[in-house]
């Protein structure tokens, strides 16, 4: 069994969270990639997702939320800038493998965005200001509709749960995955 | 609770070769990026080098490339530093760190084991 | 590469004061960083990751801020056991992840 962990991201109104998802190269350079969005409750939902197959380096942008894959190094890096108190939630990057359930990665994201200035000058990063930095090509992907065979009856953890993992990757047994969704737009 | 413990440092000659091993337990090993970051006696933490969780990807400093090898056994949880033509400047304590799930710091790290070369 | 710069190299303050520890990066590296301490014979241990966060079990004196060069480790009121070494590390993207040279906190 392995333990399904969250690290935890204190940010301000306006900031950028910036993380990166590590993959095995070999089995999922190519495999298309989503940033996922957990509610209490809910079956976690596609905010983004890369194209299919994954083109490498290439940025993918849905509203304020960037995507870049690297396969050379087996990393997504998932960038959500301009962040608003509504962004605070469980977050999770997914490895589509159809026809297969999802491969979650490590670890769950707990994004906690609070209101006001970290106190510093020029800490405080606007929406222009993390667009400007993203290439002028990046691309919208439209996110498949899968739908797990199961259903989910209860909130996902907050925490922790035991679920068994091929590899370095979660295997998730219940979850959908919808077309993205503009919540972030 | 996670834990890290280096072992295999010890004095060898310029030119020489030494192997240090981690273990590590408390954590899904298999799921983590691991490291090995340096320190020279009375100086600052230096990065050698670290090893994706798969173990599909590796990352070298310049100052190790070529002659420093990092592998890692996921079935019994260790994590290897082959260290070749081994010089002075590479004396220092060498720390097993573990990286974060999200990204490329350092969240748990082993008390080190020392490597002295000199002749 | 990216070259970390941290001031000043020595700080001198008395327990309970407030200390400020800067860390400058060479180029912008958004809110990668992170902040670590160290104390004598002992290894490094994680105080502050993505610039902002503190690591699970570290006392709230502790708080980081700052974002794209400029960064800060404040400590509101320093303790006996916060008298160490600490050193800021960017990780931006692709290695070197690179350190700065470390600042010594010190009882004045």
């Known amino acids: 069994a392995t333990k399904l962990t969250e690290e935890k991201y204190e940010l301000k109104e306006g900031q950028t969270l910036d993380v990166k998802c590590d993959y095995t190269l070999e089995k999922f350079a190519s495999s298309q990639k989503a940033w996922q969005i957990i509610r209490d409750g809910e079956m976690p939902k596609t905010l983004a997702c890369t194209e299919r197959p994954s083109k490498n380096s290439h940025p993918v942008q849905v509203g304020r939320i960037i995507l870049e894959d690297y396969h050379d190094h087996g990393l997504l890096r998932v960038r959500m800038v301009n962040l608003q108190v509504e962004d605070s939630g469980l977050y999770q990057c997914v490895i589509y493998q159809p026809p297969k359930e999802p491969h979650m990665l490590f670890d769950r994201i707990r994004l906690v965005v609070t209101k006001g200035f970290s106190g510093t000058p020029g800490s405080n990063e606007n929406s222009t200001q993390n667009v400007y930095k993203i290439p002028p090509t990046t691309t919208k992907a439209l996110c498949p509709l899968y739908t797990s065979p199961r259903t989910v009856t209860q909130a996902p953890p907050k925490s922790t749960a035991d679920v068994s993992t091929p590899d370095s990757e979660i295997n998730l047994t219940n979850v959908t995955d919808i077309i993205r969704v503009p919540v972030f737009n | 609770e996670v834990q890290v413990l280096e072992s295999g440092g010890g004095l060898v000659q310029p030119g020489g070769s030494l192997r240090l091993s981690c273990a590590a337990s408390?954590?899904?090993?298999?799921?983590?990026?691991m490291s090995w970051v340096r320190q020279a006696p009375g100086k600052g933490l230096e990065w050698v080098s670290t090893?994706?969780?798969?173990?599909?990807?590796?990352y070298y400093a310049d100052s190790v490339k070529g002659r420093f090898t990092i592998s890692r056994d996921n079935s019994k949880n260790t994590l290897d530093l082959q260290m070749n033509s081994l010089r002075a400047a590479d004396t220092a304590v060498y720390y097993c760190?573990?990286?974060?799930?999200?990204?490329?710091?350092?969240?748990?790290w082993g008390q080190g084991t020392l490597v002295t070369v000199s002749s | 590469e990216i070259v970390m710069t941290q001031s000043p190299a020595t700080l001198s303050v008395s327990p309970g004061e407030r200390a400020t520890l800067s860390c400058r990066a060479s180029?912008?590296?958004?809110?990668?960083l992170a902040w670590y301490q160290q104390k004598p014979g002992q290894a490094p241990r994680l105080l502050i990751y993505?610039?902002?966060t503190r690591a699970t079990g570290i006392p709230d004196r502790f708080s980081g801020s700052g974002s794209g060069t400029e960064f800060t480790l404040t400590i509101s009121s320093l303790q006996s056991e916060d008298f160490a070494v600490y050193y800021c590390?960017?990780?931006?993207?692709?290695?070197?992840?690179?350190f700065g040279q470390g600042t010594k906190v010190e009882i004045k």
């Open positions: 590390q960017e990780f931006i993207m692709w290695p070197p992840w690179t």
């Open positions: 993505g610039a902002y």
């Open positions: 090893i994706s969780g798969s173990g599909s990807t590796t």
């Open positions: 760190a573990k990286v974060a799930g999200s990204n490329f710091f350092f969240d748990h």
């Open positions: 408390g954590f899904t090993f298999n799921a983590y990026a």
């Open positions: 180029q912008s590296i958004n809110s990668n």
